[in-house]
């Protein structure tokens, strides 16, 4: 009796965070024995899509010509061989940006900060939202999710950073979202350049909880430290 079929690999091109209206291709790679590939979306009432394999049969393409809210969500894929269906792939989370108007990102007291001092990045939305995300360019993960308690909605979230080191320097954007779908984000805020000056270089701040990533050390997510933000949002690590 052979063991279960190995799970396929699932990925998205050009990536898993897609702007509304843009195209995205989801790939599922299995084995050369695959006869059919199936893409399932979490909590969908039926298989999301089914495709015949592309030669040499070890992968299939699932095309989304225009990204909309319908396609945002968590996917897994399977392949069928003569002995049955494979194990599911690891999940792929497809996120759509552009679902809501863009928030405003600012730095308090200033985007020019001396090393060793404190700075707070403030993400403000025009309408009340319950989740805010801070992104740093070229970071492997969102830096921080802030989600409100009990579904209470807020117009802003504060991301305090202290003490600031040169590693905090760079370009930041933020997004806002509603809790009913973590896969629908606002348009990104305009970029904010955080410039760290001075020679008060201390040790790199250690995350309050690490996030594993295959990226190099400069791509590690920066986890701002400090107290619970004044906005009433609590930290929520994904």
């Amino acid at each position: 009796q052979a063991g279960p079929l190995p799970k396929p690999t699932l990925w998205a091109e050009p990536g898993s965070v897609i702007s509304w209206g843009n195209s995205v291709t989801i790939w599922c790679q299995g084995t050369l024995e695959a006869r059919e590939y199936r893409l399932d979306k979490e909590e969908s009432p039926a298989p999301w899509d089914r495709q015949n394999p592309l030669e040499p049969k070890n992968k299939a393409r699932f095309s989304i010509p225009s990204m909309t809210e319908d396609y945002a969500g968590r996917y897994r894929c399977y392949y069928r061989s003569p002995v049955g269906w494979s194990q599911p792939s690891d999940p792929l989370e497809l996120v759509m940006t552009g679902a809501y108007s863009k928030p405003t990102l600012s730095a308090l007291p200033s985007p020019l900060v001396t090393s060793g001092k404190s700075v707070t990045l403030l993400c403000q939305s025009r309408s009340p939202m319950d989740t805010f995300l801070l992104i740093k360019e070229r970071a492997a993960h969102p830096l921080l999710h802030l989600r409100s308690e009990h579904g209470a909605q807020q117009h802003q979230a504060e991301f305090p950073m202290s003490p600031v080191t040169s590693v905090h320097g760079g370009t930041y954007r933020c997004f806002s979202s509603h809790g009913f779908s973590h896969y629908l984000l606002s348009h990104p805020s305009d970029p904010l350049e955080l410039i760290v000056s001075g020679s008060l270089e201390g040790p790199r701040p250690s995350p309050t909880r690490s996030v594993s990533t295959a990226a190099g050390p400069e791509d590690q997510p920066l986890m701002p430290t400090g107290s619970v933000p004044h906005s009433g949002l609590r930290r929520h690590w994904e």
Epitope: E43, P45, A46, D49, R50, W85, S181
Partner: antibody
């Protein structure tokens, strides 16, 4: 053309069992999910159960979980609904309906059978 | 349990545009409810019109379209025809089961 023909209905006493069948033709049955939907006299539609194309996933409405079982035999192009411990409130016309190949292709409940009447009465 | 509510009856005239709606007791209808619309003609003839990812079933005229309007699902018939007189049911998906609405009886006054 697509055809769905239900059978197996009739008059049955409360607590007894019945098995409904739905014979499919005119399409590749093994590619499609299927549903059972019922309509009590003078009432609206009530979805009962659904099954994926290959039988891997089955869904039920809470009121029939543990009493009703949906199944299929793709080699016979037939859908089944095994109904146990029947109650008076299960009296209805039972329809089978075709589901989609996949969510991005097709419309759930696109084709329906003519229905089979189940009467639960002592 | 979720309850799906539709208008019990609507009346329109040939050539007019009419919108039928479908409300969920659990809150706003979203794309995750995969709103589905089924037409019932006399003698219990049921036909699926629109569903999945807003697909229109083959043979269903283009005058039928589905959408989300505010917190409800909607079926719009643009330029109603007398043959569109029927009962229309919506069905919403709730993670692991479907729930049908009570149906809207649409009358098209000839």
């Amino acid at each position: 053309q697509v055809q769905l023909v239900e059978s197996g209905g009739g008059v049955v006493q409360p607590g007894r069992s019945l098995r409904l069948s739905c014979a499919a033709s005119g399409f590749t049955f093994s590619n499609y999910g299927m549903h059972w939907v019922r309509q009590a006299p003078g009432k609206g539609l009530e979805w009962m159960a659904g099954i994926w194309f290959d039988g891997t996933n089955k869904y039920y409405i809470d009121s029939v979980k543990g009493r009703f079982t949906i199944s299929r035999d793709n080699s016979k192009n037939t859908l089944y609904l095994q109904m146990n411990n029947l109650r008076a409130e299960d009296t209805a016309v039972y329809y089978c309906a075709r589901d989609v190949i996949s969510m991005v292709r097709g419309v759930p409940f696109d084709y329906w059978g003519q229905g089979t009447l189940v009467t639960v009465s002592s | 349990d979720a309850v799906v509510t539709q208008e019990s009856a609507l009346t329109t005239s040939p050539g007019e545009t009419v919108t039928l709606t479908c409300r969920s007791s659990t809150g706003a209808v979203t794309t995750s409810n995969y709103a589905n619309w089924v037409q019932e003609k006399p003698d219990h003839l049921f036909t699926g019109l629109i569903g999945g990812i807003n697909n229109r079933a083959p043979g269903v005229p283009a005058r039928f379209s589905g959408s989300l309007i505010g917190d409800k699902a909607a079926l719009t018939i643009t330029g109603a025809q007398t043959e569109d007189e029927a009962i229309y049911f919506c069905a919403l998906w709730y993670s692991n089961h479907w729930v049908f609405g009570g149906g809207t009886k649409l009358t098209v006054l000839g």
